[in-house]
């Protein structure tokens, strides 16, 4: 796997061990926690990420409106499993054998159960609405300015192909990012939408997965962008399975 | 060249802890994972753990988690494995070993375990 | 964990006789195994890397195939010198695990 050659280390994830002794003498990057070798010239995927984490020595008619089949991750943190290939495993479980099932991004779609709970496939996370509050200025970004800033950073920062940004929406002081990307869009060697969310989750944080490189310094036409708030909202291609009694 | 040096043996009584040096040479000790390897007589090999030196980040095989604890000593480029509360099943060759393929092996220490 | 089946678990040949050892993955570990010979009273060593990669000083006779769940380890022509334990290993994630071996006999 690709890794920074001449002193062996991951630009693109701080959060591994990197050694000469991969394939051919060629310096291999080992996630945290799971000891997969990651390829560094891309992301890392987020149940890597968050597995590393866990084993690592925290409105107006212009802006969508999250489905009601829109989800949020609200259980923050768990150690998860992952599979062969870094991906979620569609069931979850914790040291207390209470299961549930999670969507390609890692998010609670089910009621939590017992042992006995089948989540019969990964469901995929076609659309990420990530919902963000900046910091007052003295006026209003320009909205194409913003635009151009925000799909610049996706596809530069974050390598994800600049058709998957659907949208930039704009309303004074919140700003919406679309991400769309369909299982027969995704393309072999495409970034995952989830992937990109999560690395820019942890930046606007303060918490960069990056190595070496200093934070997220958003600006907008040379005006900061400084962001007080964020909420991520996660759409299934299969609606989500909740009982009423979660709803109400 | 390359090498990891074991003591040849060591006897340890029932219960006292005991800890097994690796010292390398040759390489840079900091840059390579190092393995330990465990073998009971007649038997196969089973993977303990590893550590890499330039921050001891340690993982374990589950198996040996309450028994094995792995350290370094980067002054002198020695590798230690110590056993908590050694019993007879612990009496086994016990090899360090380097990298992911493991391409240099100590020549290992048999540990008894005996009163 | 991956667990790793090596079959079989004695090997018998004639010298000048091409064997092979078979190592079978529980999961796909792409090329992330590693073979071992040990002779008696022996440490391991390693005869080749990640399922092909020949290693210096070991004879060209040995040679290693596969990816994914399935390898091979080659032995061209045996040797009496042969005599031994060959292990897989993969390094694929943590816990490395080993396969339980395969005894190589010389008739």
């Known amino acids: 796997h690709t890794a920074a050659q001449d002193n062996c280390t991951c630009p693109t994830n701080k959060m591994t061990v990197c050694s000469p002794d991969g394939p051919g003498g060629r310096c291999q990057c080992r996630a945290l926690g799971s000891g997969m070798a990651v390829d560094c010239s891309t992301l890392t995927s987020k149940c890597l990420l968050l597995k590393a984490r866990m084993s690592a020595p925290k409105n107006a008619r212009t802006l969508v409106r999250p489905s009601e089949h829109a989800l949020v991750d609200n259980d923050g943190l768990y150690d998860p499993d992952c599979d062969p290939e870094g991906r979620f495993k569609a069931r979850q479980c914790n040291q207390t054998s209470v299961c549930w099932c999670v969507n390609s991004v890692g998010v609670r779609r089910t009621d939590k159960g017992d042992l006995s709970l089948r989540c019969d496939e990964l469901v995929r996370t076609h659309h990420i609405l990530i919902d963000l509050r900046h910091r007052p200025t003295a006026g209003a970004f320009n909205h194409s300015d913003l635009d151009a800033e925000l799909r610049r950073l996706f596809r530069e920062r974050y390598r994800l192909h600049p058709k998957f940004v659907a949208a930039v929406h704009y309303e004074q002081p919140t700003i919406q990012i679309e991400l769309r990307q369909n299982t027969s869009q995704k393309a072999a060697g495409d970034v995952d939408i989830g992937d990109a969310a999560y690395y820019f989750e942890r930046d606007i944080k303060g918490e960069s997965l990056f190595q070496g490189r200093g934070g997220l310094d958003l600006r907008v036409r040379g005006e900061p962008l400084q962001v007080e708030r964020t909420l991520i909202y996660y759409l299934d291609e299969i609606p989500p399975k909740f009982s009423m009694k979660r709803l109400t | 060249q390359v090498q990891l040096q074991q003591p040849g043996a060591e006897l340890v009584r029932p219960g006292a802890s005991v800890r097994l040096s690796c010292k390398s040479s040759?390489?840079?000790?900091?840059?390579?994972?190092i393995n330990w390897v465990k073998q009971r007589p007649g038997q196969g090999l089973e993977w303990i753990g590893n550590?890499?030196?330039?921050?001891?980040?340690?993982n374990y095989n589950q198996k040996f988690r309450d028994k094995a604890t792995l350290t370094v000593d980067k002054s002198s480029s020695t590798a230690y494995l110590q056993l908590s509360s050694p019993t007879s099943d612990d009496s086994a060759v016990y090899y360090c070993?380097?990298?992911?393929?493991?391409?240099?092996w100590g020549q290992g220490t048999a540990l008894t375990v005996s009163s | 964990d991956i667990l790793l089946t090596q079959s079989p678990a004695i090997l018998s040949v004639s010298p000048g006789e091409r064997v092979s050892f078979s190592c079978r993955a529980s999961?796909?570990?792409?090329?992330?195994i590693h073979w071992y010979q040990q002779r008696t009273n022996g440490s391991p060593r390693l005869l080749i890397s990640?399922?092909?990669e020949s290693i210096s000083g070991i004879p060209s006779r040995f040679s290693g195939s596969g990816s994914g769940t399935d390898f091979t380890l080659i032995i061209n022509s045996v040797e009496s010198e042969d005599i031994a334990d060959y292990y897989c290993?993969?390094?694929?994630?943590?816990?490395?695990?080993f396969g339980s071996g395969t005894k190589l006999e010389v008739k």
């Open positions: 070993t380097r990298g992911s393929g493991f391409d240099y």
């Open positions: 040759g390489y840079t000790f900091t840059s390579y994972w």
């Open positions: 550590i890499f030196p330039s921050h001891s980040y340690t």
């Open positions: 999961q796909n570990i792409g090329t992330s």
């Open positions: 990640y399922a092909s």
């Open positions: 290993q993969h390094s694929y994630s943590w816990p490395f695990t």
